[in-house]
């Protein structure tokens, strides 16, 4: 606990103090005060330095002074033998003796008091940074003035901080401008702009005069703008040493003014002023800019659009331009979005074609769609090249955006038909031979395949049975052979309406307009097996010839057989219709006079005993097509026939072009178009 | 008259192969769908496989599946049969034969034997 | 595949006995059948077709029936030089059967 006085004496005194003892006193006074510690009497061995026996006299790590040997007072008023004053409220005393006295020593008397400290000239470091007044136990520190103590009490410092300015355009100066600023002083102006606005700051270098920087290039006084995350100084010395137009690229800044308690100068004065925030004219990749200017400012609204082949995509949703607008912290919105290449995407697939996949589907990329050659052509044109347009699609130079159509290739056969004798006086046959050849099996008949979705027959062939089960793509028609081909499911049956219904069949003598459509459920995959014959031009070009040869296929009654299992087929002449109606009816059902020939029907056969005949009804009469010797068109369809192995009767196809043209459009579907 | 004269056959070790051929004369050759058949001694027969008449479809039994290949030149009127990985069951005499139509065949060679031993 | 099943597998019988042997399919041939003669040493040789239909050039005395799984082969008077193996053959099937054959022998 500090005390304002007290003793201090050695062991044992007044009488002998011991040997080989080390005692220590520690002092304390209040706070504020020094010590003043005097002795009044000193009897302690006398030896160099004190070395052996001593009274040590300590501030924190100062010795202050050892003592030994005897002392008299020189004052004859004062008992004060020696005496010690610091500046402190702490002293520390140590007395210690040897381990002999070759005479006997009495020690020391001493005393100390709590002394006023004169803080303002008693230290090397001046307490106050201007005006020190002291009184007993403490100082206190005052200011010039205009001046005003700062919280740490010591340092005196100009009012000139707190000031905010708002207004777009103004004045700022260090105090007293243009007489020398206040030393000691931290000055901080604050300019709060609008956003969007940016501070400019303009100097010019006359108006600037801070105490130089030291040799280290340290400014002792010095001039900082701060704005946001940038700093703009420190600044010093005499002329503005910085840009004299300061774009700070923020609505906020704060101006921090340092000086120190020497050197100063006349200081500094500047003008700022508010700017719209300026964004930058960015370089947009593919884009133009409207309106187009040389700088752009705060609220400044412009256009990005993309060039042809580049869209902004924002989410799923792909536009061609986007408004940006130039904000107040100099950014532009929108800024994220880009133009980027057009997108294709996968192109869409097409049935009975393919397209590779691209490597690309991003604006001009190109890709090529193909049909399954040779099966399928495409029928729309446009050479099936599709390049990624501005636009997103894949459009093609002729089709535009429409996907191309495969339709199958008629009346190509993947095998020639190397005629010999069958049928009746006909040959064995592969269906690859006759790939449109299709089979009825009740009753039992064929039919040709003229599209994916229809099959040309007889009339006479479907009048009793409207859901016909019929094959495809197989040369044998045993059981097994056709659960292995392709069936095809009937949606519904057209008779020619000049076909006349008779309530006994069996009994009919006009076969005229013996033609009939069967509208598919799905669509026939076309191949090697399977594939449409082509129908008759409407030009005269198809109008047949007596001797012109046609094939003619089906699994009908043979020589040896009521009906064949393997596909049979044989070429045949056109004949003149008066030899069909000379040959005498086989089984006659009525008279031979009843018998119905019409222009509707051709005749052929007569060679070699090569007929068609029961069994073979509906089939194909394929006649080489005269504008394109490739391929095989249906110019005639198995009808009827006086004697098998004789003449026959075949419906003459190219004069119902027409209605089934008509017939197949009117019950065409979406899924075919 | 119609002939059928098959040759190429003989003793072969397992896992070889052989070469049977058929020359067809009498007949237009092109004409006519062409079989083999075989019959091991004192078995049956069994049908081996089928070629129509261009050459384009071929059937072959599953004993012989992957192993043997029936093939025909029309240029030269005749049929052969291609024999590989044999085995000891492929032992017996081997007919070429005509399909007059829808499989029932009409005329027969005389055979050729092919045995398969080691 | 479609087995063909020949009974009896041997018969023996007198010139001018009628003699019959059965085929039977393991499923529905339709008519899809043919009949074979093999004389010893010799190449089969074909007799009936389509079940029924007799090959040209083959004695009338031979004679076929059936249809579906159950077939007959008959020879109405038997002849010393019918001493044979007979064989049914179907083509119902992808790749046509025999039947196991069945040796006629004279008494």
């Known amino acids: 606990e500090p005390t304002m006085y007290g003793e201090i004496l050695s062991p044992n005194y007044p009488q002998a103090y011991p040997s080989e003892v080390e005692k220590s006193w520690d002092i304390e006074v209040p706070e504020g005060y020094g010590i003043h510690l005097y002795f009044t009497h000193l009897d302690i061995e006398l030896s160099e330095n004190c070395a052996y026996d001593s009274v040590q006299i300590i501030s924190g790590d100062t010795e202050e002074g050892r003592l030994c040997g005897q002392r008299s007072s020189n004052n004859p008023h004062s008992p004060i033998v020696e005496e010690f004053q610091v500046p402190y409220n702490k002293l520390q005393v140590i007395f210690k003796s040897d381990f002999s006295n070759e005479e006997r020593f009495t020690g020391f008397a001493a005393y100390y008091v709590a002394t006023d400290i004169n803080e303002c000239t008693d230290f090397v470091d001046v307490p106050c940074s201007h005006f020190c007044n002291n009184f007993i136990g403490g100082y206190f520190c005052s200011c010039p003035p205009e001046y005003f103590l700062h919280d740490d009490m010591k340092n005196c410092g100009v009012n000139c901080s707190g000031d905010v300015f708002t207004a777009l355009i103004g004045e700022i100066a260090s105090p007293n401008y243009p007489k020398p600023y206040p030393e000691n002083s931290r000055c901080e102006y604050q300019i709060r702009l609008e956003k969007g606005f940016q501070v400019v700051v303009t100097l010019r270098r006359e108006d600037f005069d801070v105490e130089a920087a030291d040799s280290a290039g340290n400014c002792l006084d010095s001039l900082v703008f701060v704005a946001g995350d940038r700093q703009f100084g420190p600044y010093c010395g005499h002329g503005f040493p910085g840009p004299l137009n300061i774009e700070t690229k923020s609505n906020a800044l704060d101006i921090i003014f340092q000086t120190d308690l020497t050197g100063q100068k006349k200081g500094w004065k500047l003008r700022y002023h508010g700017d719209p925030m300026p964004c930058p004219k960015e370089d947009t990749p593919n884009s133009v800019w409207e309106p187009a200017k040389a700088k752009y400012v705060f609220r400044d609204v412009v256009q990005i659009t993309c060039l042809d082949g580049f869209e902004v995509v924002e989410g799923r949703v792909g536009a061609t331009s986007f408004y940006s607008t130039c904000q107040s912290n100099g950014k532009w919105s929108n800024s994220k979005l880009k133009c980027q290449p057009v997108d294709c995407g996968i192109p869409e697939s097409i049935e009975n074609g393919k397209v590779e996949d691209p490597e690309s589907t991003l604006f001009g990329s190109v890709i090529r769609y193909t049909c399954e050659e040779p099966y399928y052509y495409m029928e729309n044109g446009g050479g099936g090249e599709y390049h990624c347009a501005g636009n997103g699609s894949w459009v093609n130079e002729v089709l535009g955006p429409e996907l191309p159509k495969c339709v199958p290739v008629c009346g190509v056969p993947r095998e020639p038909f190397e005629e010999k004798q069958r049928i009746i006086g006909g040959s064995d046959a592969d269906i690859k031979n006759f790939p449109w050849q299709v089979f009825f099996d009740n009753p039992w008949a064929g039919g040709a395949l003229i599209n994916e979705y229809w099959v040309l027959t007889a009339a006479h062939v479907v009048e009793g049975n409207r859901e016909p089960t019929m094959y495809v793509g197989s040369t044998s028609v045993q059981t097994s052979r056709l659960a292995k081909s392709k069936m095809l499911t009937p949606e519904h049956v057209f008779i020619h309406p000049g076909w006349k219904l008779l309530e006994v069949p069996e009994g009919r003598t006009n076969f005229d307009n013996d033609i009939a459509l069967v509208r598919l459920k799905d669509p026939v995959k076309m191949g090697p097996t399977v594939s449409p014959i082509c129908l008759p031009g409407t030009s005269s070009d198809y109008n047949l010839m007596d001797g012109d040869l046609g094939l003619i296929s089906g699994w009908g009654r043979t020589e040896k057989r009521d009906r064949a299992v393997r596909l049979k087929a044989a070429r045949l002449p056109v004949a003149p219709l008066r030899k069909c109606k000379e040959v005498k009816v086989e089984k006659p059902t009525a008279d031979a006079e009843a018998y119905v020939f019409t222009p509707n029907m051709i005749c052929a056969g007569g060679e070699k005993g090569m007929d068609s005949c029961k069994g073979d009804s509906g089939g194909a009469f394929a006649v080489q097509d005269p504008n394109d010797k490739t391929k095989f068109y249906a110019a005639g369809l198995v009808s009827w026939g006086p004697q098998c192995g004789t003449y026959g009767l075949y419906t003459r196809v190219k004069n119902y072009v027409d209605w089934i043209m008509k017939t197949m459009q009117e019950n065409s579907t979406p899924r075919e178009d | 008259q119609v002939q059928l004269v098959e040759s190429g056959g003989g003793l072969v070790k397992p896992g070889g192969s052989l070469r049977l051929s058929c020359a067809a004369s009498?007949?237009?050759?092109?004409?006519?769908?062409m079989s083999w058949i075989r019959q091991a001694p004192g078995k049956g027969l069994e049908w081996v496989s089928y070629?129509?008449?261009?050459?384009?479809?071929?059937y072959y039994a599953d004993s012989v599946k992957g192993r043997f290949t029936i093939s025909r030149d029309n240029a030269k009127n005749s049929l052969y049969l291609q024999m590989n990985s044999l085995r000891a069951e492929d032992t017996a005499v081997y007919y070429c034969?005509?399909?007059?139509?829808?499989?029932?065949?009409?005329?027969w060679g005389q055979g050729t034997l092919v045995t398969v031993s080691s | 595949d479609i087995q063909m099943t020949q009974s009896p597998s041997s018969l023996s019988a007198s010139v001018g006995d009628r003699v019959t042997i059965t085929c039977q399919a393991s499923q529905d041939i339709s008519n899809y059948l043919n009949w074979y003669q093999q004389k010893p040493g010799k190449a089969p040789k074909l007799l009936i077709y389509d079940a029924s239909n007799l090959e040209t050039g083959v004695p009338s005395r031979f004679s076929g029936s059936g249809s579906g799984t159950d077939f007959t082969f008959t020879i109405s008077s038997l002849q010393p030089e019918d001493i044979a193996t007979y064989y049914c053959q179907q083509y119902e099937d992808l790749i046509p059967t025999f039947g196991g054959g069945t040796k006629v022998e004279i008494k």
């Open positions: 034969a005509r399909d007059e139509s829808d499989y029932a065949l009409d005329f």
């Open positions: 009498g007949f237009t050759f092109s004409d006519y769908y």
């Open positions: 070629i129509s008449r261009s050459g384009s479809t071929k």
